[in-house]
Interface confidence: low
């Protein structure tokens, strides 16, 4: 809920539909990157406000007679990460009336993403010739996951996943070995996670 103790009056949902809020180049970036938050209204608006939910005033205003407002966050720091929402309003709505807030956009500013876990499904000990599934699980959605095998320089498999995990299938004959994984943002500027702890797959 973005309605704080002062100054924001949000009308019922039927009044003015919520805008869309997105981030360029990404919602996960390293410190020092310039981030643009774009708030797009479903109709031309007069003023846009960018909020961190729960704060009593907007972080930024933009007065633009169009459907799109851009908020520039220069050389972001980890402290600027967190939840953001935007609203818009038109002068004919009367002061104090804003649209419904956009869905929350989570901005993460970090040097390194949290270490993922790597587990074998159903377990790390498999029957000879049986396929095995490895799950690399991070904490963020829409990431690219990479599986490594010890002794092999190149990544073994890639997966892009909308979920905070990715599953890799190992064919039975080649399954035994030592594996690790990591994940990263799907586009530049890339933010990488730490590597997972290693997982040893062996035959019964």
């Amino acid at each position: 809920d973005i309605t704080p103790s002062v100054a924001i009056i949000v009308p019922p949902a039927s009044y003015h539909p919520k805008p869309w809020l997105g981030a360029q180049p990404a919602t996960v970036v390293t410190p020092g990157v310039n981030v643009t938050l774009r708030c797009r209204a479903p109709q031309p608006a007069w003023r846009f406000g960018l909020f961190k939910p729960g704060e009593i005033a907007p972080l930024l205003f933009r007065d633009v007679s169009s459907e799109l407002a851009e908020f520039f966050l220069e050389e972001v720091t980890p402290a600027q990460g967190g939840s953001y929402r935007c609203c818009y309003r038109r002068p004919d709505w009367g002061p104090g009336v804003w649209s419904q807030p956009s869905d929350v956009l989570e901005l993460l500013v970090t040097e390194e993403l949290p270490r993922p876990s790597l587990v074998a499904l159903p377990g790390p000990v498999v029957g000879p010739g049986a396929n095995v599934s490895l799950r690399c699980a991070g904490r963020l959605r829409n990431m690219s996951f990479v599986l490594y095998r010890e002794g092999v320089a190149a990544p073994l498999q890639y997966r892009h996943s909308a979920q905070p995990w990715a599953d890799f299938t190992l064919l039975g004959a080649r399954a035994p070995g030592t594996y690790s994984c990591y994940y990263h943002t799907p586009s530049a500027p890339y933010v990488l996670s730490q590597r997972s702890e290693v997982l040893v797959i062996s035959w019964e």
Epitope: A7, I9, P58, F61, R62, D63, V64, P95, G96
Partner: antibody, heavy 118, light 108 residues
């Protein structure tokens, strides 16, 4: 601490000019609508002019052409240039910050007295 | 002559409930929000109510605001001697901010 401090008031002759300043501290000056409100001795509050975050300033009809509002975001300061002053402009002039909706004034300065007299 | 009309004076005894009215038109109060300010003698106005009925933090819940049609009202319950002040309503009309003429509240 959030503070507004007006200055520049004083005694001026009819037809003269005066420039009022309002120095703000404690929040991001550039993010807000700023306004001047005046109060003649023993009278009520009267809105004078406002400076939006972007776009043209707006004025109450009585002041259009004689008064000019401006702001310097780098100095966190709001100004009111008053020309062709009349005796009826004698008042305490308050600078105030609008709540972000622009619909109300949530922080006020202590006011500066302008006296127009010969 | 103010566009928003308030009674010039109101009074009450300690502990009483007092209501101050503010009358406008469809172009201001009727279509916009109303705020209320308290001005103690010799001081700057202070925001009491915004958006018709919302209290900023720090304002006691003895103060309440409401709006109906083209009129608004400020109610003060449990009246105290320190409530003796001038009270102003404020709204918005076609890019201008409008104030009522003010009501002087006397605590008897």
């Amino acid at each position: 601490e959030v503070q507004l401090l007006e200055s520049g008031g004083g005694l001026v002759q009819p037809g003269g000019s005066l420039r009022l300043s309002c120095a703000a501290s404690g929040f991001t000056f550039s993010d807000y609508y700023w306004t001047w409100v005046r109060q003649a001795p023993g009278k009520g509050l009267e809105w004078v002019s406002g400076s939006p975050v972007f776009g043209a300033a707006n004025y109450a009809q009585n002041f259009q052409g004689r008064f000019t509002i401006s702001r310097d975001n780098s100095k966190n300061t709001l100004y009111l240039q008053m020309n062709s002053l009349r005796a009826e402009d004698t008042a305490v002039y308050y600078c105030a910050k609008a709540g972000f909706t622009g619909g109300h004034f949530d922080i006020w300065g202590q006011g500066t007295l302008v006296t127009v007299s010969s | 002559q103010s566009v928003l009309t308030q009674p010039p004076s109101a009074s009450g005894t300690p502990g009483q409930r007092v209501t101050i009215s503010c009358s406008g038109s469809s172009s201001n109060i009727g279509n916009n929000y109303v705020s209320w300010y308290q001005q103690l003698p010799g001081t700057a106005p202070k925001l009491l109510i915004y958006g018709n009925s919302n209290r900023p933090s720090g304002v006691p819940n003895r103060f309440s605001g409401s709006k109906s049609g083209t009129s608004a009202s400020l109610a003060i319950s449990g009246l105290r001697s320190e409530d003796e002040a001038d009270y102003y309503c404020q709204s918005y009309d076609s890019s201008s901010w409008l104030f009522g003429g003010g009501t002087k509240l006397t605590v008897l």
